[in-house]
């Protein structure tokens, strides 16, 4: 059985302020069962950006239909980007449990924000 990989294809993404940013992520296996979460930053102070199963994230939408069977595309789109959104974003796979256990993180994608074109 192949080892689970979380693939974030791009090292960096640059977006103009006011636009939407797409952060790509795929997993190489549906096993073990458990959600994907997106964070900005690493360590105890990291910020939760999106949780696949719970919470309300009004500016974040999944790119692929999360209800689609065998979906392994966990890319997200963040709308109305501002300079405050700059940072490195990590797609993280968890194993279902109480609480969920972090299994594997993607390599990270750095989001940089360009000034809005005048």
């Amino acid at each position: 059985e192949e080892e689970l990989q979380v693939i974030q294809p791009e090292k960096s993404v640059s977006v103009a302020a006011g636009e939407s940013a797409t952060l790509n992520c795929t997993a190489t296996s549906l096993i073990p069962v458990g959600p994907i979460q997106w964070f900005r930053g690493v360590g105890p102070g990291r910020e939760l950006i999106y949780h696949q199963k719970e919470g309300h994230f009004p500016r974040v939408t999944p790119v692929s239909d999360p209800t689609k069977r065998n979906n392994m595309d966990f890319s997200i789109r963040i709308s109305n980007i501002t300079p405050a959104d700059a940072g490195t974003y990590y797609c993280v796979k968890f194993r279902k449990g109480s609480p969920d256990v972090e299994l594997k993180s993607g390599a990270g994608t750095e989001l940089s924000v360009r000034a809005k074109p005048s």
């Epitope: 990989q5 693939i7 974030q8 294809p9 791009e10 090292k11 960096s12 790509n24 795929t26 997993a27 190489t28 065998n70 392994m72 993607g106 390599a107 990270g108 994608t109």
Partner: antibody
Framework: DVQLVESEGGVVRPGESLRLSCEAS????????MTWVRQAPGEGLEWVST????????YYADSVKGRFTISRDNSKNSLYLQMNSLRAEDTAIYYC????????????WGLGTLVTVSS | ALTQPASVSANLGGTVEITCSGG????YGWYQQKSPGSAPVTLI????NRPSNIPSRFSGSTSGSTSTLTITGVQAEDEAVYYC?????????FGAGTTLTVL
């Protein structure tokens, strides 16, 4: 066994059109992103276009954008490339490839078909 | 763009490494083409994954911005052009190719 079989290419004049097809078998076609890659004589591999599993999203190299259209028919396990306004620099062997997990990675390739654009 | 050496050589039975670097990719794949116009064969996808029909003498690793294809116990039939491929579309997906000559 996974098989990808491209249709016969051909010789066309600059400005003319040609449609390539690729018939897939041995895997669940409707679940796979599919890609066209080409190789001009004496040159390296060049990505041309990719289409999503459902066919609702397509990606194109700048060199073919606006001239080529990728499409698929999941009921026929077939991939297509409609090439319009062909140029001499489009002369190449065109390969059909199956994408793996992330669409810029390919796990299976067709044998390729030669397209020659010449006056 | 992805950068790889134009050519490398290796002794029969020896070990050779082919590197690929640059671009905006976090992950890489490797493809072998034995002669111009023949169908490419996937050796490695997503850094380290080897298809089941590929001999174990082919392995891949990625560190930072550099991916390395290693062939241990080089065989005469490994003489070919090797292309790296990136995970970022902005990289044009493929490197220019490296010709391996077996001595």
């Amino acid at each position: 066994d996974v098989q990808l079989v491209e249709s016969e290419g051909g010789v066309v004049r600059p400005g003319e059109s040609l449609r390539l097809s690729c018939e897939a078998s041995g895997f669940t076609f409707r679940n796979s992103y599919m890609t066209w890659v080409r190789q001009a004589p004496g040159e390296g591999l060049e990505w041309v276009s990719t289409i999503s599993d459902t066919g609702d999203t397509a990606y194109y190299a700048d060199s073919v954008k606006g001239r080529f259209t990728i499409s698929r028919d999941n009921s026929k396990n077939s991939l297509y490339l409609q090439m319009n306004s062909l140029r001499a620099e489009d002369t190449a062997i065109y390969y059909c490839a199956k994408s793996w997990i992330w669409w810029t990675f390919f796990d299976y390739w067709g044998l390729g078909t030669l397209v020659t654009v010449s006056s | 763009a992805l950068t790889q050496p134009a050519s490398v050589s290796a002794n029969l039975g020896g070990t050779v490494e082919i590197t690929c670097s640059g671009g905006n990719s976090n992950h890489y794949g490797w493809y072998q083409q034995k002669s111009p116009g023949s169908a490419p064969v996937t050796l490695i996808y997503a850094d380290t994954n080897r298809p089941s029909n590929i001999p174990s003498r082919f392995s891949g690793s990625t560190s930072g911005s550099t991916s390395t294809l290693t062939i241990t116990g080089v065989q005469a039939e490994d003489e070919a052009v090797y292309y790296c491929g990136g995970s970022s579309t902005g990289d044009g997906i493929f490197g220019a190719g490296t010709t391996l000559t077996v001595l």
